[in-house]
């Protein structure tokens, strides 16, 4: 049913869903702090633009009686229950921030007539792609898939002279929410990744993974997995690895690689780590860039969600346009706005674009180094280190199939 929105006469409200089931185990208090920090910035920006309006957030908490797994497994109904609560209380804002779980976002989008924008920190799965009023502020699975296909096909770099067309994917079911959907997308038989590869097999058992490392009859030298170095070590330990094995470790939301005193453990020498650039601006902005670790990535996406709303509100108010319209609901895409940590770009479908970074371990220094960067906005790879000190033969990435000559 249609819910009236608290979104007019100079007073604009943001509905923030504070769900017990969340993509990341971030204390709700931290998310609340991030939202409040965002509100302060938005108020300042609107005031500077001569717009004398009120912007507030209403935090909608779930009772947690039924949906208490804490992760995303029981989130499907929790989101709808919260929407019902909003509906009964007639407390809908101009925009909905949250949910972060793919299940709940998909279901809420499906089961409601959304005439308002929905901003999510998460919703990584392919089922949340191409939703007209949904904006996602953390890299969705589609972006990862496009990088992998781009990288697999690349064969004209000094360190990668072979196109790849095969891969193993390790997926054992214990992944975090982001990893679950990233690997789910790679596994899906109808996905772009599967369509572009000639061979792809999912390894579901630890032993399967461990056996492949030295199996002379393996069908691919490349293994994709998702998680941090500790996750890899638990699985791989100090086992011997064939010299032409390449492990691609997807670890997008982990800044630990960019700490100055970090030395790469020995077990990372056969590994390329795919992560997000920790910030791409040459100049510091006027307000602090040093978010505390608890506010990294997930909480930052909440904060940026508030700033995005402020950006759109400012544009519509300056143009004298109504906020409670389908036009406003559909406007949160194909734009760049000033985020907390620098400019944030959203693509045509409202998904955040970013710079992904592929790291390798230097055999000389045992430090992580940038091999290349990838701009999701233009789907382009930019080599950085033209003569990497790899563990692989001739300091070049091997072919994906042992014994196959140049393509």
């Amino acid at each position: 049913s249609q819910v009236s929105q608290n979104c007019h006469n100079g007073s604009y409200e943001i509905s923030v869903l504070m769900m017990g089931n969340s993509a990341f185990a971030e204390p709700l208090k931290n998310l609340e702090d991030a939202v409040n920090e965002g509100l302060e910035i938005v108020r300042g920006r609107l005031q500077n633009a001569g717009l004398n309006v009120t912007v507030n957030a209403t935090f909608m908490y779930s009772d947690g009686l039924i949906h208490n797994s804490g992760d995303c497994r029981s989130s499907t109904c929790e989101g709808l229950d919260l929407l019902r609560k909003i509906s009964n209380a007639q407390r809908m804002g101009c925009v909905l921030i949250g949910p972060s779980c793919t299940y709940s976002t998909f279901q809420m989008y499906l089961d409601t007539e959304l005439s308002y924008p929905m901003i999510s920190a998460g919703s990584f799965g392919l089922s949340c792609d191409y939703k007209e009023t949904l904006t996602r502020l953390m890299s969705p699975a589609r972006k990862l898939m496009y990088f992998l296909v781009n990288f697999w096909k690349t064969n004209d770099l000094p360190f990668k002279t072979y196109s790849w067309s095969t891969s193993y994917v390790y997926k054992n079911g214990t992944e975090t929410e982001d990893c679950f959907w990233y690997l789910n997308a790679l596994e899906a038989s109808v996905s772009y990744f599967s369509h572009e590869l000639g061979f792809k097999v999912v390894l579901r058992q630890d032993k399967e993974f461990q056996d492949i490392l030295m199996d002379h009859n393996r069908k691919s030298n490349v293994i994709i997995m998702c998680g941090g170095p500790e996750f890899l070590y638990k699985l791989k330990g100090d086992r011997a690895v064939a010299e032409d094995i390449v492990i691609i470790l997807v670890d997008l939301f982990n800044d630990q690689y960019f700490e100055d005193n970090v030395t790469a453990p020995d077990y990372m020498k056969n590994v390329l780590v795919l992560t997000l650039s920790p910030g791409n601006s040459l100049l510091n902005s006027s307000f602090s860039r040093n978010l505390s670790p608890t506010k990294r990535d997930f909480a930052l996406a909440y904060l940026n969600g508030i700033l995005l709303f402020g950006h759109m509100l400012k544009i519509f108010l300056e143009n004298g346009e109504n906020i409670t319209t389908p036009k406003f609901a559909h406007a949160f895409r194909n734009l760049t706005f000033e985020g907390y940590d620098g400019p944030v770009t959203l693509d045509d479908w409202g998904d955040v674009d970013s710079t992904m970074v592929l790291l390798y371990t230097s055999v000389d220094t045992k430090k992580y180094k940038v091999l290349l960067t990838y701009d999701t906005h233009v789907n382009k790879t930019y080599p950085v280190d033209m003569s990497p000190t790899f563990t692989w033969k001739n300091s070049k990435l091997p072919n994906d199939i042992t014994g196959r000559g140049p393509q």
């Epitope: 100055d260 920790p278 280190d385």
Partner: nanobody, 123 residues
Framework: EVQLVESGGGLVQPGGSLRLSCAAS????????IGWFRQAPGKEREGVIC???????KYADSVKGRFTISRDNAKNTLYLQMNSLRAEDTAVYYC?????????????????WGQGTMVTVSS
């Protein structure tokens, strides 16, 4: 003796491309943070791109998506690939190096500077 020598500048039409090189001698590029700067006639020198010693590129907003940086340690040379050039990119381009205190941040100042190479974007 530490030396940086830029090359590759010249006259190019708007929308065109150029690749600048910065050859280093007397030290290993790999251990240093490297920056490209430019100074347009009558203007102050401004930072364009920095490559941290860990290899992380950081761009000025004005060149993001158009300029890219890479490093070939075997040749001890840094490259600046400039695409979609505009008239406002006309300047003398300098490369500079700094013994890195941080592997992932651009240094506040640079110890060594090249002589510069002129880039003119004009039809």
């Amino acid at each position: 003796e530490v030396q940086l020598v830029e090359s590759g500048g010249g006259l190019v039409q708007p929308g065109g491309s150029l690749r600048l090189s910065c050859a280093a001698s007397g030290f290993t590029l790999d251990d240093y943070a490297i920056g490209w700067f430019r100074q347009a006639p009558g203007k102050e020198r401004e930072g364009v791109i920095c490559l941290t010693s860990g290899g992380l590129p950081k761009y000025a907003d004005s060149v993001k998506g158009r300029f890219t940086i890479s490093r070939d340690n075997a040749k001890n040379t840094l490259y600046l690939q400039m695409n979609s050039l505009r008239a406002e990119d006309t300047a003398v381009y300098y490369c500079a190096a700094s013994g890195a205190t941080s592997r992932w941040n651009c240094p506040p100042q640079y110890d060594h500077w090249g002589q510069g190479t002129m880039v003119t974007v004009s039809s």
